[in-house]
């Protein structure tokens, strides 16, 4: 089952996600999506990084920490009830089926 996180309407939601880069600055792509992690990639992508930097993000969705050190936690600004649901953090480690997938449940009150 998903780990549950809570936030209040109008506040910021924080969804933690971490990995350990193989070497400093040796990043792997990460995607965040709304909905449970599918077999590949992320569905309904809200933010994505590549091997170097953030390369896609949408309004209100931000990386919250020092992603170059493996902190790829997500901040959702000014949440509404519509933001409730499952979010997928996917660490896209090279190789077949090597990805680390984390499903996080956001509950808005």
């Amino acid at each position: 089952s998903e780990v549950e996180y809570r936030a209040e309407v109008g506040q910021n939601a924080y969804l933690p996600c971490f990995y350990t880069p193989a070497a400093p600055g040796n990043l792997v792509p990460v995607c965040w999506g709304k909905g449970a992690c599918p077999v590949f990639e992320c569905g309904n992508v809200v933010l994505r990084t590549d091997e170097r930097d953030v390369n896609y993000w949408t309004s209100r969705y931000w990386l919250n920490g020092d992603f170059r050190k493996g902190d790829v936690s997500l901040t959702i600004e000014n949440v509404t009830l519509a933001d409730s649901g499952i979010y997928c953090c996917r660490i896209q480690i090279p190789g077949i089926m090597n990805d680390e997938k984390f499903n996080l449940k956001l509950v808005i009150k």
Partner: antibody, heavy 122, light 109 residues
Framework: EVQLLESGGGLVQPGGSLRLSCAAS????????MSWVRQAPGKGLEWVSA????????YYADSVKGRFTISRDNSKNTLYLQMNSLRAEDTAVYYC???????????????WGRGTLVTVSS | QTVLTQPPSVSVAPGKTASISCGGD??????VHWYQQKPGQAPVLVIY???DRPSGIPQRFSGSNSGNTATLTIHRVEAGDEADYYC???????????FGGGTKLTVLG
């Protein structure tokens, strides 16, 4: 081309107030965290305050907390710093700086304005 | 709160290599950014995320970060590199952006 242009500096007496502005152009203003950084004459850089892209979160150095207020008007592409209860030690060049992209905090300062001088003296 | 310690000054002959250190408790666990500031001018970002170089910054500039020390290295130093250099980190514990005290790089001759 990214441009940041500060204004509003000048001479003010201790205890007085001043409002700095930073007009931004060349990028989608609301997508970036912004900061104010100052430099006293002959001294190093000191971060003063930061604000998230939407303006929903603000952060302050301990030295200015309760006296300075950062804000932004995304419809005008403008960043502000309201400075109250000014002290002699607030004398500095104040720079407006744009944070890095895709990060809530704007981890580093990618672009800087030329600065505006604030002098607090009687 | 993290304190960033830089040497006040570094001198180097033209064509040689200059190294400017930035010390801090476990600074290797944070991303370090470096700025160059020439007299009467605004700072310019020269290194970000420990070792990345913005476009327009010569390859002579490089950075590293490990343990308790981050280092800015300038190879084949030129007279135009004479400036003040500042390291910077984002301290997420305090939500403060921190600068080192700055290092004045003097190019001899």
């Amino acid at each position: 081309e990214v441009q940041l242009l500060e204004s509003g500096g000048g001479l003010v007496q201790p205890g007085g107030s001043l409002r700095l502005s930073c007009a931004a152009s060349g990028f989608t203003f609301s997508s970036y965290a912004m900061s104010w950084v100052r430099q006293a004459p002959g001294k190093g850089l000191e971060w003063v305050s930061a604000i998230s892209g939407s303006g929903g979160s603000t952060y302050y150095a301990d030295s200015v907390k309760g006296r300075f207020t950062i804000s932004r008007d995304n419809s005008k592409n403008t960043l502000y710093l309201q400075m109250n209860s000014l002290r002699a030690e607030d004398t500095a060049v104040y720079y407006c700086a744009r944070g890095s992209y895709g990060t809530y905090y704007g981890n580093y300062f990618e672009y800087w304005g030329r600065g505006t001088l604030v002098t607090v003296s009687s | 709160q993290t304190v960033l310690t830089q040497p006040p000054s570094v001198s180097v002959a033209p064509g040689k290599t200059a190294s400017i250190s930035c010390g801090g408790d476990n600074i290797g666990g944070k991303s370090v950014h470096w700025y160059q500031q020439k007299p009467g001018q605004a700072p310019v970002l020269v290194i970000y995320y420990d070792s990345d170089r913005p476009s327009g910054i010569p390859q002579r500039f490089s950075g590293s970060n490990s343990g308790n020390t981050a280092t800015l290295t300038i190879h084949r130093v030129e007279a135009g590199d004479e400036a003040d250099y500042y390291c910077q980190v984002l301290d997420r514990r305090s939500d403060h952006w921190l600068f080192g005290g700055g290092t004045k790089l003097t190019v001899l001759g």
